[in-house]
Interface confidence: low
């Protein structure tokens, strides 16, 4: 039997991940082979209750590899190059069960920032141009802007007009997320527009 759809597993750069293995209930396991991108990673022969025979066949990942009692693979100090396809073949006397995994290594998001390019018009309407960013962003990061629980934009950029005469105080929140972390940063339209107003007044004097 084989599991055709790989299990998607997310790992955090520099941290550890476990690829969970379920072995066939009630069957004696003769050996387990773990593969990474179709090359042998480790070969396990159940040997004693506490210490199976473990042959690590990939020296590159070897020191970062460990196995649980149920033969699940643990990989520590994750690197971007650990991204890829992992397979475990569990061999019993009568069958071989295949489990497939896709490991994706993601960075923990850090340092969310919002930059503001705003302008004040003669009618006192304030136009906010907000851009959200995180350190080392990649394709796995998504951004969205929210106000009062409503999504205003699914982009890092947001442009809004704010009129202090008719708008109540309003916070705009940028949310940056990937599969392993999320960050948010809120800005006050009133505060930003006041700052612009001060600058505007200064330049007029």
């Amino acid at each position: 039997q084989s599991s055709l759809t790989p299990l998607m597993v997310n790992g955090i750069l520099g941290e550890s991940v476990t690829l969970p293995l379920e072995f066939p209930a009630g069957e004696k396991v003769n050996f387990i082979t773990w593969l990474f991108n179709e090359t042998s990673l480790a070969f396990i022969v159940p040997h004693e209750t506490k210490s199976p025979e473990i042959h690590v066949t990939n020296p590159k990942q070897g020191k970062r590899l460990n196995f649980t009692q149920s033969y699940s693979l643990q990989l520590s100090n994750l690197k971007m190059e650990d991204t890829g396809s992992y397979r475990a073949q569990i061999s019993t006397k009568t069958s071989a069960k295949l489990s497939s995994y896709t490991l994706r290594i993601l960075r923990q998001l850090r340092n969310i920032q919002v930059t503001n390019h705003s302008q004040l018009f003669q009618n006192m309407t304030c136009e906010l141009h907000l851009t959200c960013s995180v350190e080392d962003a990649d394709d796995n990061v998504s951004f969205r802007w929210e106000a009062l629980g409503n999504t205003l934009s699914s982009q890092p950029n947001l442009t809004v007009s704010w009129d202090p005469r008719i708008s109540s105080e309003q916070d705009y929140t940028c949310i940056a997320e990937n599969a392993v972390s999320n960050l948010s940063f809120s800005v006050s339209a009133q505060k930003l527009c006041e700052d612009v107003k001060i600058q505007y007044t200064d330049t007029k004097m």
Partner: antibody, heavy 117, light 106 residues
């Protein structure tokens, strides 16, 4: 240290059901299979079935298929064996056992189930 | 089902004797496992994967065999070895046990 503690003796009437519990401690419950074995008075050992507490996956001796249900509650590290439509020849000591790499390494103390009208 | 036939069913021997129990499978099996059971107690793992002694088992015990024929040996019987011994196989569901061999002191 590893321990499997089973529920107490039961007396049941033919046709009834019995549910035996097996509480595990001293190890990661979901990392090992739990097997169930019975032994009729003065007789040998008979394998009933196995459960993987992590996934809930089971495998039964066909002889008991349809009459036995193995379950596990991960939150309290307890496995259960329920046997229905009891007959007098189901009178036995029922054991739970942990499977290490490939053998029963720790056993419960056994639960005597007596089926009598 | 794979039948496991142990012989003898019971055995009386003297302290210091060499004792041999056989376990014959009705078809080839990969390994045989042996358990020791004392009256009123749960079985204990004794020999796993045909010839490996479980933790705490004295070295006077040994196991051997392949295919359908397996042997369990005590090189020098001791009073504490008095028990019933069962063989077991994992190859096919149902995972069967032999009927047991009861060991007694003469």
């Amino acid at each position: 240290q590893v321990q499997l503690v089973q529920s107490g003796a039961e007396v049941k009437k033919p046709g009834a059901s019995v549910k035996v519990s097996c509480k595990a401690s001293g190890y990661a419950f979901t990392n090992y299979l739990i097997e169930w074995v019975r032994q009729a008075p003065g007789q040998g050992l008979e394998w009933i079935g196995v459960i993987n507490p992590g996934s809930g996956g089971t495998n039964y001796n066909e002889k008991f298929q349809g009459r036995v249900t193995l379950t596990a509650d991960k939150s309290i590290s307890t496995a259960y064996m329920e046997l229905s439509r009891l007959r007098s020849d189901d009178t036995a000591v029922y054991y739970c056992a942990r499977r290490g790499w490939d053998y029963f390494d720790y056993w419960g103390q056994g639960t005597l189930v007596t089926v009598s009208s | 089902d794979i039948q496991l036939t142990q012989s003898p069913s019971s055995l009386s021997a003297s302290v210091g004797d060499r004792v041999t129990i056989t376990c014959q499978a009705s078809q080839d099996v990969s390994y045989i496992y042996w358990y020791q059971q004392k009256p009123g107690k749960a079985p204990k793992p004794w020999i796993y994967r045909t010839s490996n002694l479980a933790t705490g088992v004295p070295s006077r015990f040994s196991g051997s065999g392949s295919g359908t024929d397996y042997t369990f040996t005590i090189s020098s019987l001791q009073p504490e070895d008095i028990a019933t011994y069962y063989c077991q196989q994992w190859d096919n569901n149902p995972y069967t046990f032999g009927q047991g061999t009861k060991l007694e002191i003469k």
